[in-house]
Each structure stands twice: as structure tokens, then as C-alpha cells.
């Protein structure tokens, strides 16, 4: 037999069916020009010493073979003895290691078998009623196709599916969408209506994420508040990476999960913008305010479940940074200014009450005064911090108040509202004899003592009603008792106590009269 012809003789090797899983597969045959034809196939397994034979049975029932040697592609003309206008059945037999391996056969009319391309270029993926829709441009001059897909997950083998007949300039396919695992898809096409035409090669992988992006499993930690009033939010644990099917590992566009960080600043609710969304890789600096932080995972199908954490406010207080002066017109606060043209947010809330009851006020951008201080004033009529109780005050600053991540904490402190000097007056002052020339004075703690850092000291005043001499005794804010010594028996005294803050002198308590009785010896 001539090599260019199909040989109508018994094949030149014995029959020894291997039954093995390896061997020739994916046989494709098609016309490549007006009078030439090509068949190509894949061979799976060791290729050393393998000889391939393209087998053909004509519609007449006669069978022949082409010897391809070690090649897996063979061309022949319409004069090779194979009828190209009638149906033929073709397959490959590979002879290796004394056994024969056979490919699946194809039955087709060669003249009408055109080499079809798989979907080329961009395959658009979208979600449609819980299914996956793929769409692509029909390859040039190839309108009219049957389309198949195959898909696999990281843990499952390929499964075959059918897209149905296509007859347009764009082709599409509805495929199953997995809820929680990524999938790899490949598509192939063949000529529509041409009995037994060969399938194209499989397309490049199309990598598809699960319908639900994986829930982010991350942990955060927050550093200490720095001198600049900001603290770094750091990621302790990266989100788990999505497991990908084999063909999607490495570069897998389409399966990407983006993690975004949504910050919600709970403090200072009167500012313009309370939330900001950032990329997870870019960890922000935060003020000492309270925040809710959500990590939102999303893929090309949209957002998934999010995970939320609460970052409590930094409650470290500055004992002396804030000056408050109370005048007839109202109250003014002074604190060290941060920089030029800063907007400040002053937030206050009664101590011991729910954070939701915080009130705040936003200043217009202001420059430092000549003493380098920033100020905020309010009138008595405004009612701000007007009740006689302890308030927790936090001042935040920003040069760009519209940018959530640029706020910093200036200070946090406590302030006693209303008429603090009167409200703080100690009550229940009592005097007890201590010795022949001394007494012990006790009083109930001032209301100011409920406000950390506000009560600077108590002052106990003792007045000799005879000589009108007055002595004053400072007492630590944590003490509510003092011993007065050097008193004379039989003399009338009055004692009063007041509670002072750093910027306000308190009001004396009601005078308490006492005297030490003269001891008469027997």
C-alpha cells in the first residue's frame, strides 16, 4: 500500500486489545481545503514505541487503514480511497508494547465536516435565575453549532453537559452554579446538523466563583492610641483563600474574591460621613472613637455574608488638657489646638448611660488662638451639659472631616455639668471628738467625686468664733475625713467643707458648730 492511500488490507499488527484506560482519544477529522482532509488525535500514556493507525470503514462496509507512525496528525486527499461524500466511520488504533489501544470512533461525512473552533476570546459570565449564563461571540464563519460544556470543582471530576443548538452571531449556555465552591468550565463546539462532525478542542478554562463568596474568617487587633490621637487597626489573620479547580490554579480571573473593610465610626454622630469602605489590604489608622468594622466578601456575582466586629472607644483620659471656664454668658472650653484649619467634634454623654445618648457639636474649621488653644463655647440656654451630673467628653479633630479615616482623638476627659461649684458642695458634715485638743471631721463624698479627675481637692475651713481666726486644710480628693488639732477647750468653732475643681472653687457647706468641753479634774 502507498503511504498516501488508505490500505484495504488487514492491519500489520496482531489484535491484542489492551483494555487499558490510556491510549488514543479525541479524534477529530475535517476538510482543510477543497480536496484535502486532516485527522488529529491525542495520545494518553507513554509515547515511546507507539505506532498509530487511522482506521476507516466506508459506507460500503469495506475497511482500510492509514499508517501514521508516531505522529498524531494525518492528512490525506480525496483520492486516498476514502469516500468523502458518504458517511464513514473512523477511529485510531495505537499499537504499543504488544497491545492495541483504540480511540472512540467518529462517524461523519468528511466533505461536510468543517474544523470548528471552540469559543475564542472573551467568555462573559453572569448569573441568571440561580444559574450560570455564559456568552461569547461565534467564531467567524461558524454560525450553526452544537455546544457542550464540561465542568469540575476542586474535589470532583469533569462532568459533561449540553448547551443545545446555537444559530446566531453570539452563542450562550446555561450551566449549573455551585453555591459554595469554585468551578472550572470548558466549552467545545461542532458543526450543527452535520452528522457525526468532530468536536472542536476544548476552550481555555473559564473559572467561576461560587454563588456565595466565602465568609471572611479574619481577626483584628487595635494598637494603643498614639501621641497623635490615632491607633492602627491591624489584621491578625488573613482571609482564607478559595480552593480552586486544577485548571484555575495560578492565574484564575473570574474567581477572585475581594474583601473590603467597611468602617462605621459610632462616636461623633454629628459629623458629615459616618462610614467608609476600604480595601482589606490597606489597614487604616483610627481615632480613639468606637467603631463597627465589617469585612465584606464579594465576587463577580455580588457581595456575600459579612463579618462584623465592634471596636470599643479608647477610654484613656487626659487629666489636665481641657480647661473649662464658666461665665455669666455661658461656658467655654479650651484645649491645645492640633493645627491650622482644624474641624473639631466635641462629644459628651452622661457617665453611666448608654453610648447612644451621646450628644455632639461640630465646630467650623478654626485656627489656634494666640495661646495655641482651640475653643468651643455654648450658652446656658443651649442646655449643653446643663444638668448637674458627670459628663464624659471626647474631642476629635480632623483637617478633612469628610474623610472618616483622618479623624484623631485630641483628648478624652470628664466634666461636671451645670453649677458644679454648688452641686459639688459636700453634705452630712459631722464632727466627733478625737482627743483633748482635736476633732475628727467627716463628710459625705462630693458629687464631683463621681467624675474621675474633676475633683481636685477638698478644703476644710475651721473658724474660731472668739478670735475670728480661720484656718484652711486641703484634703486629698480620695479622703472624706480630716483631723483638726490644736483646738482649745471651751471655745466655739464652726467648720465648713468645700470641693474644688481645677478651674472652679466650690461653695462652702453649711457651717457646723462645735466645741471641745472643758475637762474638770476631780
Amino acid at each position: 500500500c502507498r503511504t498516501s492511500e488508505c490500505c484495504f488490507q488487514d492491519p500489520p499488527y496482531p489484535d491484542a486489545d489492551s483494555g487499558s484506560a490510556s491510549g488514543p482519544r479525541d479524534l477529530r477529522c475535517y476538510r482543510i481545503s477543497s480536496d484535502r482532509y486532516e485527522c488529529s488525535w491525542q495520545y494518553e500514556g507513554p509515547t515511546a514505541g507507539v505506532s498509530h493507525f487511522l482506521r476507516c470503514c466506508l459506507s460500503s462496509g469495506r475497511c482500510c487503514y492509514f499508517a501514521a507512525g508516531s505522529a498524531t496528525r494525518l492528512q490525506f486527499s480525496d483520492q486516498a480511497g476514502v469516500s468523502v461524500l458518504y458517511t464513514v466511520t473512523l477511529w485510531v488504533e495505537s499499537w504499543a508494547r504488544n497491545q492495541t489501544e483504540k480511540s472512540p470512533e467518529v462517524t461523519l461525512q468528511l466533505y461536510n465536516s468543517v474544523k470548528y473552533e471552540p469559543p475564542l476570546g472573551d467568555i462573559k459570565v453572569s448569573k441568571l435565575a440561580g444559574q450560570l449564563r455564559m456568552e461569547w461571540e461565534t467564531p467567524d464563519n461558524q454560525v450553526g453549532a452544537e455546544v457542550q460544556f464540561r465542568h469540575r470543582t476542586p474535589s470532583s471530576p469533569w462532568k459533561l453537559g449540553d448547551c443545545g443548538p446555537q444559530d446566531d452571531d453570539t452563542e450562550s449556555c446555561l450551566c449549573p452554579l455551585e453555591m459554595n465552591v469554585a468551578q472550572e468550565f470548558q466549552l467545545r463546539r461542532r458543526q450543527l446538523g452535520s452528522q457525526g462532525s468532530s468536536w472542536s478542542k476544548w476552550s481555555s478554562p473559564v473559572c467561576v466563583p461560587p454563588e456565595n463568596p466565602p465568609q471572611p474568617q479574619v481577626r483584628f487587633s487595635v494598637e494603643q492610641l498614639g501621641q497623635d490621637g490615632r491607633r492602627r487597626l491591624t489584621l491578625k489573620e488573613q482571609p482564607t483563600q478559595l480552593e480552586l479547580p486544577e485548571g484555575c490554579q495560578g492565574l484564575a480571573p473570574g474567581t477572585e474574591v475581594t474583601y473590603r473593610l467597611q468602617l462605621h465610626m459610632l462616636s461623633c454622630p454629628c459629623k458629615a460621613k459616618a462610614t467608609r469602605t476600604l480595601h482589606l489590604g490597606k489597614m487604616p489608622y483610627l481615632s480613639g472613637a468606637a467603631y463597627n468594622v465589617a469585612v465584606i466578601s464579594s465576587n463577580q456575582f455580588g457581595p456575600g455574608l459579612n463579618q462584623t466586629w465592634h471596636i470599643p472607644a479608647d477610654t484613656h483620659t487626659e487629666p489636665v488638657a481641657l480647661n473649662i471656664s464658666v461665665g455669666t454668658n455661658g461656658t467655654t472650653m479650651y484645649w491645645p489646638a492640633r493645627a491650622q484649619s482644624m474641624t473639631y467634634c466635641i462629644e459628651w454623654q452622661p457617665v453611666g448611660q448608654d453610648g447612644g445618648l451621646a450628644t455632639c457639636s461640630l465646630t467650623a474649621p478654626q485656627d489656634p488662638d494666640p495661646a495655641g488653644m482651640a475653643t468651643y463655647s455654648w450658652s446656658r440656654e443651649s442646655g449643653a451639659m446643663g444638668q448637674e451630673k458627670c459628663y464624659y467628653i471626647t474631642i476629635f479633630a480632623s483637617a478633612h472631616p469628610e474623610k472618616l479615616t483622618l479623624w484623631s482623638t485630641v483628648l478624652s476627659t470628664y466634666h461636671f455639668g451645670g453649677n458644679a461649684s454648688a452641686a459639688g458642695t459636700p453634705h452630712h458634715v459631722s464632727v466627733k471628738n478625737h482627743s483633748l485638743d482635736s476633732v475628727s471631721v467627716d463628710w459625705a463624698p462630693s458629687l464631683l467625686s463621681t467624675c474621675p479627675g474633676v475633683l481636685k481637692e477638698y478644703v476644710v475651713r475651721c473658724r474660731d468664733e472668739d478670735s475670728k481666726q480661720v484656718s484652711e486644710h486641703p484634703v486629698q480628693p480620695t479622703e472624706t475625713q480630716v483631723t483638726l488639732s490644736g483646738l482649745r477647750a471651751g471655745v466655739a468653732y464652726t467648720v465648713q467643707v468645700r470641693a474644688d475643681t481645677a478651674w472652679l472653687r466650690g461653695v462652702w457647706s453649711q457651717p457646723q458648730r462645735f466645741s471641745i468641753e472643758v475637762q474638770v479634774s476631780d
Partner: nanobody
Framework: QVQLVESGGGLVQAGGSLRLSCLAS???????MGWFRQAPGKEREFVAA????????WYADSVKGRFAISRDNAKNTVNLQMNSLKREDTAVYYC??????????????????WGQGTQVTVEP
């Protein structure tokens, strides 16, 4: 070793139909399968053949358009649907398996395994 057992033969009126079935013990999905027949005093002749996947089918001119061969590899069966039967279709019908597929699908000598046959009789 493949064993083939035919069934479905019988007596039928001319113009009637019969469906012959061939059950193989062992995997025959790698073999071309064929049906042959032998009338009394005549040579065994080719009726129909089918390729391994069922994509390719071949028929003797005398049965073309009346007989249809099919296979189900999952069940290891090959069927021959015979319609518009004629008196000259009377014969013993044999199922055969061809592991090699040499130079033709219709040569008796090409086939390696044979069944015992089933009788088909067509009455006028």
C-alpha cells in the same frame, strides 16, 4: 471469552415485525457487532453491522430500509429490529462480534465470536 445469546426469533406473518436481541457476557463495547443469517442449504450471509459506539451502521442491500441495528453498551446488548418481513427473510439469525475489524464489516471470517442462532420463520 465472550459468549453471545440470541433471543426474539419466532414465527411471523409476512409484512410483520420482530425484534431480535443479542446479549453478550463480557464487555463488547470494544467490538464491532454484526447480524448474519443462514437459510437452509445456503451460505451464511451478512445482514447488518454496527460500530463500537453505534455511530456507524451497515446493511445488506436486501434489508436496507426494513431492518435497523442498534446497541446498548451499558447493557451489553445488540438489537435487530426487523420490519416488513418477507418470506425470503426466513433463516437462522446469528449474532457475531468482531474484535479486529480487518478489511470489511460484512465478511463472515472477520468475526471472532458467534452465538447459537435464533430461528425466524416468515409465513406467507
Amino acid at each position: 471469552q465472550v459468549q453471545l445469546v440470541e433471543s426474539g426469533g419466532g414465527l411471523v406473518q409476512a409484512g410483520g415485525s420482530l425484534r431480535l436481541s443479542c446479549l453478550a457476557s463480557g464487555r463488547t463495547s470494544n467490538y464491532f457487532m454484526g447480524w448474519f443469517r443462514q437459510a437452509p442449504g445456503k451460505e451464511r450471509e451478512f445482514v447488518a453491522a454496527i460500530s463500537r459506539s453505534g455511530g456507524g451502521t451497515w446493511y445488506a442491500d436486501s434489508v436496507k430500509g426494513r431492518f435497523a441495528i442498534s446497541r446498548d453498551n451499558a447493557k451489553n446488548t445488540v438489537n435487530l429490529q426487523m420490519n416488513s418481513l418477507k418470506r425470503e427473510d426466513t433463516a437462522v439469525y446469528y449474532c457475531a462480534a468482531d474484535r479486529r475489524t480487518g478489511t470489511s464489516v460484512y465478511t463472515v471470517d472477520e468475526y471472532d465470536y458467534w452465538g447459537q442462532g435464533t430461528q425466524v420463520t416468515v409465513e406467507p
